[in-house]
């Protein structure tokens, strides 16, 4: 088989022969040299999937539960293309599974318990496994047959497809439980019914149930949605308020050497050739001689999806969770109020030394996970491997964007209600050495330009967007001569001056001598003409504060600011000499975790804060002399955030804005993967 | 979420003067730079002066040096702009516009993440 052929699994007769028609129609259309389609028939979705595993086929299009299937060892596939509905200019890969009430019930999600519950049907996503396999763990206790635990949770329900004379409860609203239309209560429509005729007190369907059921505004304002940090919004909220963001149908490869390039070459000219509305005698979403066929007929295209994404992250914490607790029934020993040891994500062995330390004197509170770059970190908070981690604002907008929310703010000055005041921000400024008598703001091109890392505010993000609203493209390697970047691609003159070793050269970690604001400040002393850093970076390595080598001779008299009016000012005059003022470095964490991590942390910089005199015997959590490990070093307290308890409104518009500009000249694969699954 | 509130504007004979005045509401407490734009028919809009409203500094367009003057009270969350002299050639449309992020030193409109509905000013010969 040549190495540009796609091997389809295909699970049935109906599907080989379809699968041979894709194949010799997409022969007709495509060069030689071009993509081709072999076909390879199994007798199931998980024979495909082992197949797959095994390099005996390609690819399959899969459910939500088998891509969970796929994902897992020693399966190990992950989505690479998705199919969508809607229209091309709104593009639909993702349905919301919600939990509906009448706006009057006055419960919440952690209240249903003894209320009457409607289910679209037994084994179905949106409608049992995913809100039984959230509240798997509510449940009492045998929780095996499973029917029987949910039969004796809620006071009555309709499931249909249940079986009534095991489980009468479960068919309680729905005499008979009838597995099809017949039962007037079956399906996404009918479990909405059970909730609008008054039979159940919540409904578990797809977001869309609503509008398609109710297309009168006035009516849906009857009922809301309830949200699994047990409050209420409109339905029309959906994405802000579900129970689990599902894919509908998704293409899987291997995870290595899985041709996913080729995949998306390959279905990217068969939807331009065979997509909706496109030719009379093959079409790619219709199945003459049967229903959905290797893709859904309700699809309209296909969409890739973004490298960066592996299972975990495509089907989301909260459906991975569901079906976990479904799958493996495993719950704590006993449901408690205590929380749970928050997992600190540190980054790289530098942090990793300074969390163990705080682990062990935290006596267990603190657990550490480590990650080699913060996106990483926020990966692996998103799929619940971590849980919290400190990051510079540029981070908290792409934490932002992945669904993860800031719950504490790092305060940098001394007041008496320092917990309780969240500072409005620092400074980003730019600095130079005073003997570079000639630079300005206006003439830095091809200069020498330390950052602190690609997307953090003061070292990117502002500079970078200053720098974008002038120059109008993002090619900013070819504004400076050279640079150190940390995170920059490693073949770019933005990793030229850096001075990691080996692997670790220009890496956004302190393996990385040049990295964050001390490294930043370090390039500027050792190579660079400028440096992009805080207002408080010059002060803290100078005069002989810091006491490495290359900086304990150091005075701040040598250096000054870049003004944007094109002037110079002396180092203290940051407040009328600054690039911009930036948001806070803050805390996030999941939102389930937010009243846990918020918790913890203030009992942990009562015990290990400031009010510590001394560090050189005692732990100090906002101290690891000027490197800024886990907290910046200047981190007087944590503060609450009172309102300002969501990126969006704790970042500022104007940064979100100002980020989100960037966001063509952006790099994250993270970001791309999260705008994925929240555009 | 912020809001912008000019007023003061008015029609002047060339030679007078005039005071605008910008009300600010909602998350104001951390203003990094506040300031007066103007546009004419038909042109660009301008900057004409800022203020760093935690060190009282300001910043003066070449056009209104000497003859315009930008003040604060930050009790009241009001930015004021006294213009004296004025000539016909600043009739325009004067907005008040704000950032949270960005410094002043620049009267770089694309710094400028707020701005109020306008206040006209017009000034006859």
């Known amino acids: 088989v040549p190495d540009k052929t796609v091997r389809w699994c295909a699970v049935s007769e109906h599907e080989a022969t379809k699968c041979q028609s894709f194949r010799d129609h997409m022969k007709s259309v495509i060069p030689s040299d071009g993509p081709s389609v072999a076909c390879v028939k199994k007798a199931s979705y998980l024979d495909c999937i082992r197949a797959i595993a095994a390099n005996e086929a390609d690819a399959v299009t899969l459910d939500a539960g088998l891509v969970y299937d796929a994902y897992l060892a020693p399966n190990n596939l992950k989505p690479v293309v998705a199919e969508f509905y809607g229209s091309k200019e709104d593009p639909q890969t993702f349905y919301y599974a919600v939990a509906v009430v009448k706006k009057d019930s006055g419960f919440q999600m952690n209240q249903l318990r003894g209320k009457k519950s409607c289910h679209t049907g037994l084994g179905r996503s949106a409608g049992w496994n995913i809100p039984i396999g959230l509240l798997y763990c509510d449940l009492p206790e045998p929780r095996k047959p499973l029917e029987k635990a949910v039969a004796n949770f809620f006071s009555g329900s309709c499931a249909p497809c249940a079986d009534g004379t095991d489980f009468p409860q479960l068919c309680q609203l729905c005499p008979g439980c009838g597995c099809s239309t017949l039962n007037q209560y079956f399906g996404y429509s009918g479990a909405f019914k059970c909730l609008k005729d008054g039979a159940g007190d919540v409904a578990f369907v797809k977001h869309s149930t609503i509008f398609e059921n109710l297309a009168n505004k006035a009516d849906r304002d009857q009922y809301e949605l309830l949200c699994l940090d047990n409050t209420r919004k409109p339905v029309d909220e959906y994405k802000d308020c579900h129970l689990a963001q599902v894919p509908s149908h998704t293409v899987v490869a291997r995870s290595m050497g899985g041709k996913e390039d080729l995949i998306w070459e390959l279905l990217n000219q068969a939807q331009e050739h065979f997509g909706k509305d496109k030719s009379k005698e093959f079409q790619l979403f219709s199945s003459p001689h049967g229903k959905d066929l290797l893709f859904k007929d309700s699809a309209h295209g296909f969409l890739k999806v973004p490298p960066r994404m592996d299972a975990k992250m495509y089907l989301g914490y909260e459906y991975v969770t569901a079906i976990r607790n479904l799958r493996e029934g495993t719950c704590p020993e006993a449901p408690t109020d205590e929380c749970k040891p928050v997992k600190w994500c540190a980054l790289s062995h530098h942090e990793r030394l300074k969390c163990d330390e705080w682990s062990v004197n935290s006596v267990g509170k603190i657990e550490c996970v480590s990650a080699e770059t913060t996106e990483d970190c926020i990966a692996k908070i998103m799929n619940g491997e971590a849980d919290a981690m400190s990051l510079d604002g540029g981070f908290v907008y792409i934490a932002g964007k992945c669904g993860l929310v800031p719950v504490l703010a790092e305060n940098y000055n001394k007041s008496d209600n320092c917990e309780d005041t969240p500072e409005a921000g620092y400074f980003a400024i730019a600095v130079v050495k005073k003997s570079a008598s000639d630079l300005t703001w206006d003439n830095l091109k091809g200069k020498k330009s330390c950052h602190t890392a690609v997307g953090r505010t003061a070292g990117w993000n502002i500079p970078m967007g200053l720098l974008y609203n002038k120059i109008n493209h993002c090619r900013f390697d070819e504004f400076f001569s050279e640079g150190c970047a940390p995170g920059s691609k490693k073949d770019s003159s933005l990793c030229k001056l850096c001075m990691g070793s080996g692997l670790n050269l220009c890496e956004p970690n302190n393996k990385e001598g040049y990295y964050g604001y001390t490294g930043a400040f370090r390039c500027l002393v050792e190579k660079g003409d400028v440096a992009f850093v805080k207002h408080q970076t010059v002060p803290q390595n100078t005069g002989g504060k810091n006491p490495d080598p290359w900086a304990k001779n150091l005075n701040e008299k040598d250096y000054e600011l870049l003004c944007l009016d094109g002037t110079r000012k002396p180092v203290e005059e940051y407040a009328n000499c600054h690039l911009a003022r930036a948001p806070n470095h803050a805390v996030v964490t999941r939102k389930d975790k937010e009243a846990c991590v918020h918790k913890i942390l203030r009992q942990q910089q009562h015990l290990f804060g400031s009010n510590v005199t001394d560090c050189s015997g005692n732990f100090c959590l906002f101290r690891s002399e000027t490197k800024d490990l886990l907290f910046r070093d200047d981190t007087v307290c944590l503060a609450k955030l009172h309102d300002r308890n969501t990126y969006e409104k704790y970042l500022g518009e104007e940064y979100v804005k100002a980020v989100g500009n960037l966001r063509k000249c952006s790099t994250s694969s993270l970001l791309e993967a999260c705008t994925f699954r929240r555009p | 979420d912020v809001q912008l509130v000019e007023s003061g504007g008015g029609s002047v004979q060339a030679g007078g003067s005039l005071r605008l005045s910008c009300a600010a509401s909602?998350?104001?407490?951390?203003?990094?730079?506040m300031g007066w734009f103007r546009q004419a028919p038909g042109k660009e809009r301008e900057g004409v002066a800022t203020i760093n409203p935690g060190t009282g500094s300001t910043y003066y367009a070449d056009s209104v040096k000497g003859r315009f003057s930008i003040s604060q009270d930050n009790a009241k969350n009001t930015v004021y702009l006294q213009m004296n002299t004025l000539k016909p050639e600043d009739t325009a449309m004067y907005y008040c516009a704000a950032t949270q992020l960005f410094g002043c030193g620049s009267l770089a409109k694309s710094l400028f993440g707020y701005w109020g509905q306008g206040t006209l000013v017009t000034v006859s010969s």
């Open positions: 909602g998350y104001t407490r951390s203003f990094t730079c």
